[in-house]
Interface confidence: low
């Protein structure tokens, strides 16, 4: 009598979740009388996938009709495939009996699901940081599978290499998570820098998933201060510009101390940006040369994104014996840019 | 309709021996992963024993070497063969239906008691 | 063994409200978590399988979530008929093994 075979003619078959899969099956003989059942994993803890001979399976139909008496073919249809559903299936031949003897087992087919990666999250710093400073980017996606998957970042479209990928768990698993940590040197060019982590994997057919952060969340460029004296107006007015430039973000608070004595306090707002994404403050301040009898010292203190102050000072000169009311008494610039006694930057 | 039915259960001293039985109707008992599962008097529930649709058996650890399951295909019932019986054994016994899918259970027996006292 | 700790061990709610209990399993179970309803008395009925697949006839006030450790099942709208004591289960590897039970009962 001719040995009786249980043939599963694909070693592997591979399914897109959401999708059916047809696990094929068939014996060689219909002799001698018994079920096929079909199951996912071996030994004694595998789990029944389909019973051909009676039971409810709401996702597993058979490919024919196993009633009829002269069929040879035991293949089924798994719809709606999930991640969990991966495993080794395994068509098994029983003898009639009481209880049912296992006569042979195919050799099984491994269903390997292709679960899409999750649109990749960028995240960046929690607080800003200045030009010349690293910053780290995390970049995560979820739940794909197979494990094989590429991970890139890129800054303002050139590749990044201070990189580190993780891809978990490390061992077998139905679907699996990448993250990803970037280094990334901040210039003062940056406030219109993007970051992108690209997400290639089989399932997406060469259209990888792409995640952005803008480099404009992550980044405080400080400003420059410059102090200068206009020439001497008629009325004895000395103007005086504070020019605060090239700072980002715009949130920003500048005031004018003379002596010492607060003079007044302005916010900047609704600044024009520059090409580069910062932001350019002019404030002005009139002295009144005839009401001070002693040099006056000005001070432009200007506090940006909570930071500590940076103060830039002026002296504007008040001659010694000033002539009459409405003459022509000159305000000397010293010419020297005092620095803030706690470190502000010139 | 589907149904179990449990019998057997009674009054049994220490070291006594007890036989349970399953009647199951509506469906082929042997088609199905069968498990019996007790419950002692104000606990909760604990898994006993299991016999698969090839006949393969299992048992919880505080059963093993004095429980036999086994099942008579002609009858469609299921057994539980009881011997060196403790008080702790002492309990409501179900007769449990494995679920063809993935053998969660579906289909409960109404139960028999056991009690092991001298 | 796989341990199935369940919370809480009693809960008092009213008719019409909202009720949540968890399961953690000591090892992943992927989603085998079954949940079962039990009348003083009566034997067990089961409600959900695979964690939140309903058996044939529960209404759809049951629903179950959760894979991996962590499961729990809810229930949207009680009435006087749910109070009752639930168990949780799992049955991803022998033994199978039930949660201690949450008894619910009418505040």
């Known amino acids: 009598e001719e040995e009786l075979q249980v043939i599963q003619p694909e070693k592997s078959v591979s399914v897109a979740a959401g999708d059916s899969a047809t696990l094929n099956c068939t014996v060689s003989s219909l002799i001698p009388v018994g079920p096929i059942q079909w199951f996912r994993g071996a030994g004694p803890g595998r789990e029944l996938i389909y019973n051909l001979k009676e039971g409810h399976f709401p996702r597993v139909t058979a490919v024919s009709d196993p009633t009829k008496r002269n069929n040879m073919d035991f293949s089924i249809r798994i719809s709606n495939i999930t991640p969990a559903d991966a495993g080794t299936y395994y068509c098994v031949k029983f003898r009639k009996g009481s209880p049912d003897v296992e006569l042979k087992s195919g050799a099984g087919t491994e269903l390997s699901v292709r679960a899409k990666p999750s649109a990749p999250v960028v995240s960046g710093p929690a607080v800003r940081a200045t030009a010349e400073h690293t910053v780290s980017f995390t970049c995560e996606s979820h739940g794909f599978s197979p494990r094989d998957i590429t991970l890139k970042w890129f800054k303002n479209g050139n590749e990044l290499s201070d990189v580190q990928t993780n891809v978990d768990p490390a061992g077998k698993s139905v679907s699996y998570s990448i993250r990803s940590t970037a280094r990334v040197l901040l210039t003062r060019r940056d406030v219109h820098s993007q970051v992108i982590c690209e997400v290639a994997h089989v399932t997406l057919q060469g259209d990888p998933l792409r995640g952005t952060a803008n480099l404009s969340e992550a980044i405080r460029v400080p400003p420059f201060l410059e102090v200068t004296q206009q020439s001497m107006r008629a009325d004895n007015q000395v103007n005086v510009t504070c020019q605060v430039t090239k700072f980002y973000p715009q949130r920003l608070q500048l005031t004018w101390l003379e002596n010492g004595n607060v003079s007044r306090t302005e916010m900047a707002s609704a600044l024009p940006e520059n090409k580069d994404g910062t932001y350019n403050w002019t404030s002005w301040l009139l002295v009144n040369v005839s009401a001070h009898r002693d040099d006056v010292k000005l001070t432009c203190q200007v506090e940006h994104d909570g930071q500590p102050a940076v103060n830039k000072s002026f002296s504007v000169k008040v001659s010694a014996h000033p002539k009459e009311q409405g003459s022509n008494t000159a305000a000397e610039n010293t010419g020297t840019n005092e620095r803030n006694i706690y470190g502000g930057s010139g | 309709e589907v149904q179990l039915v449990e019998s057997g259960g009674g009054l049994v001293q220490p070291g006594g021996s007890l036989r349970l039985s399953c009647a199951a109707s509506g469906f082929t008992l042997s088609s199905y992963d069968m498990h019996w599962v007790r419950q002692a008097p104000g606990k909760g529930l604990e898994w006993v024993s299991a016999i698969g649709t090839a006949g393969d058996t299992y048992y919880t650890g505080s059963v093993k070497g004095r429980f036999t399951i086994s099942r008579e295909n002609a009858k469609n019932s299921l057994y539980l063969q009881m011997n060196s019986l403790r008080a702790a054994d002492t309990a409501v016994y179900y007769c449990?239906?494995?679920?063809?899918?993935?053998?969660?259970?579906?289909?409960w027996g109404q139960g028999t008691m056991v009690t092991v006292s001298s | 063994d796989i341990q199935m700790t369940q919370s809480p061990s009693s809960l008092s709610a009213s008719v019409g409200d909202r009720v949540t209990i968890t399961c953690r399993a000591s090892q992943g179970i992927n989603n085998y978590a079954a949940w079962f309803q039990q009348k003083p008395g009566k034997a067990p009925k089961s409600l959900i399988y695979?964690?939140?697949s309903l058996h044939s006839g529960v209404p759809s006030k049951f629903s179950g979530s959760g894979s991996g450790t962590d499961f729990t099942l809810t229930i949207s709208s009680l009435q006087p008929e749910d109070f009752a004591t639930y168990y949780c289960q799992q049955y991803v590897s022998y033994p199978y093994t039930f949660g201690q039970g949450t008894k619910l009962e009418i505040k």
């Open positions: 449990v239906r494995g679920g063809v899918w993935d053998d969660a259970f579906d289909i």
């Open positions: 695979t964690a939140s």
